[in-house]
């Protein structure tokens, strides 16, 4: 958020940018949470729009029997490792080809025991409120498919007739991690020291991180003719003075006619 300054006062403005704002020669460039000529105002809504995609990572172990382990396989930059990685990746791409959420595999470690392959299966889906269900289903299909292939593609008479062969009993799912999307947590974090006063409200299944100074939500503070302003002690109404009235009260709902006050004063004189 930026506010441009014109005229003689600009030089003074430069040294007065508040809340971490920086002067760019024309205006104060404000950090995300602030706006105003001097970055003195706190925004009333923060964009915590959900991520476009949500990821999951499955830690799996399979035992490849069609390759004999050699020490070179421990070195990720060796020709042996690179060739193994290429074949293993191609094989897994075939195994998981029917899973729309499948992104790829990442080998973390190869160790002795024919070749024990510790790897991650990476999944990704577009964000929807049902993303957990979608990814849970995908992880189940991954388990089914890897179990099936490691049961079917096995050595016969010491030779593998498939791209890779496996030990049926060597397939294990160690861990499943789904990227957690927590709008409330994100809202609190992004609001920093104002976190206690920002809340998440939903519209059309989309989360909005707002303070009571944002109009149009159930938590919105009605300042009537006044202006809602956020401070470290919470939202406050700054009441206005018009040509005819002074306004006061917590929500600027108490108006006092100036003429009455002036008239009253005249009586005292």
């Amino acid at each position: 958020r930026t506010t441009t300054c014109f005229g003689d006062g600009c030089q003074n403005t430069a040294s007065r940018c508040k809340n971490g704002g920086t002067w760019d020669g024309l205006k104060c460039q404000c950090p995300n949470l602030y706006y105003g000529e001097l970055c003195e105002e706190v925004v009333s809504s923060i964009d915590i729009g959900p991520p476009e995609t949500i990821s999951a990572q499955m830690e799996l172990t399979v035992t490849v029997t069609s390759v004999k382990f050699t020490e070179e396989l421990k070195n990720h930059s060796s020709q042996e490792f690179q060739e193994f990685k290429q074949t293993f990746t191609e094989q897994m791409n075939i195994v998981y080809s029917g899973i729309p959420e499948y992104v790829g595999v990442n080998i973390t470690k190869l160790r002795l025991g024919s070749v024990v392959v510790e790897h991650d299966v990476l999944l990704r889906t577009k964000y929807t409120p049902e993303y957990k269900t979608v990814l849970d289903n995908a992880t189940e299909v991954v388990k089914e498919k890897i179990t099936k292939v490691t049961t079917q593609q096995i050595m016969i008479n010491d030779i593998c007739s498939d791209m890779m062969c496996f030990n049926t009993t060597g397939t294990q799912v160690q861990n499943i991690t789904v990227t957690q999307y927590d709008p409330e947590e994100d809202c609190r974090k992004m609001a920093k020291e104002y976190g206690d006063y920002f809340v998440v409200e939903y519209r059309d299944q989309k989360p909005y991180c707002i303070s009571p100074c944002e109009p149009g939500f159930s938590v919105s503070k009605n300042c009537n003719l006044g202006k809602c302003q956020m401070s470290l002690s919470g939202p406050q109404c700054l009441c206005v003075t018009t040509e005819t009235h002074w306004y006061s009260g917590e929500t600027c709902n108490q108006g006092t006619q100036k003429s009455l006050v002036y008239g009253h004063h005249h009586h005292h004189h």
């Epitope: 004999k68 074949t87 050595m155 593998c160 007739s161 890779m164």
Partner: nanobody
Framework: DVQLVESGGGLVQPGGSLRLSCAAS????????MSWFRQAPGKEREGVAI???????GYADSVKGRFTISQDNAKNSLYLQMNSLRAEDTAMYYC?????????????????WGQGTQVTVSS
């Protein structure tokens, strides 16, 4: 860049013999595996024989007892001695290599290939 060049193919009568050779550009495969594959017209490429750096050899059922695979690491060469040849052995024969110690006779498991040498068994 790895290069494999096959030679020794030709026309032979049923029951005859041939010896195929494959020259590798360097000795990198002496710690991995080498193999022979073949492809007849209109058919898929199939594994024939495999030899690994640990001395292990394996053969397709169709050639067991008739073909012998061997290698000479000093010459960076692979050989296939083919005896008792049959008409069904007619195919283009390819040499394949891997840095891995493989036990697989599926072409998808192999990354480095020669251009092939034609073997025709006919009377």
């Amino acid at each position: 860049d790895v290069q494999l060049v096959e030679s020794g193919g030709g026309l032979v009568q049923p029951g005859g013999s041939l010896r195929l050779s494959c020259a590798a550009s360097d000795n990198t495969f002496s710690r991995g595996s080498m193999s022979w594959f073949r492809q007849a017209p209109g058919k898929e490429r199939e594994g024939v024989a495999i030899i690994s750096s640990d001395g292990w050899t394996g053969y397709a059922d169709s050639v067991k007892g008739r073909f012998t695979i061997s290698q000479d690491n000093a010459k960076n060469s692979l050989y296939l001695q083919m005896n008792s040849l049959r008409a069904e052995d007619t195919a283009m024969y390819y040499c394949a290599a891997s840095f891995l110690v493989l036990r697989a006779l599926n072409p998808k498991a192999w990354h480095y290939w020669g251009q092939g040498t034609q073997v025709t068994v006919s009377s």
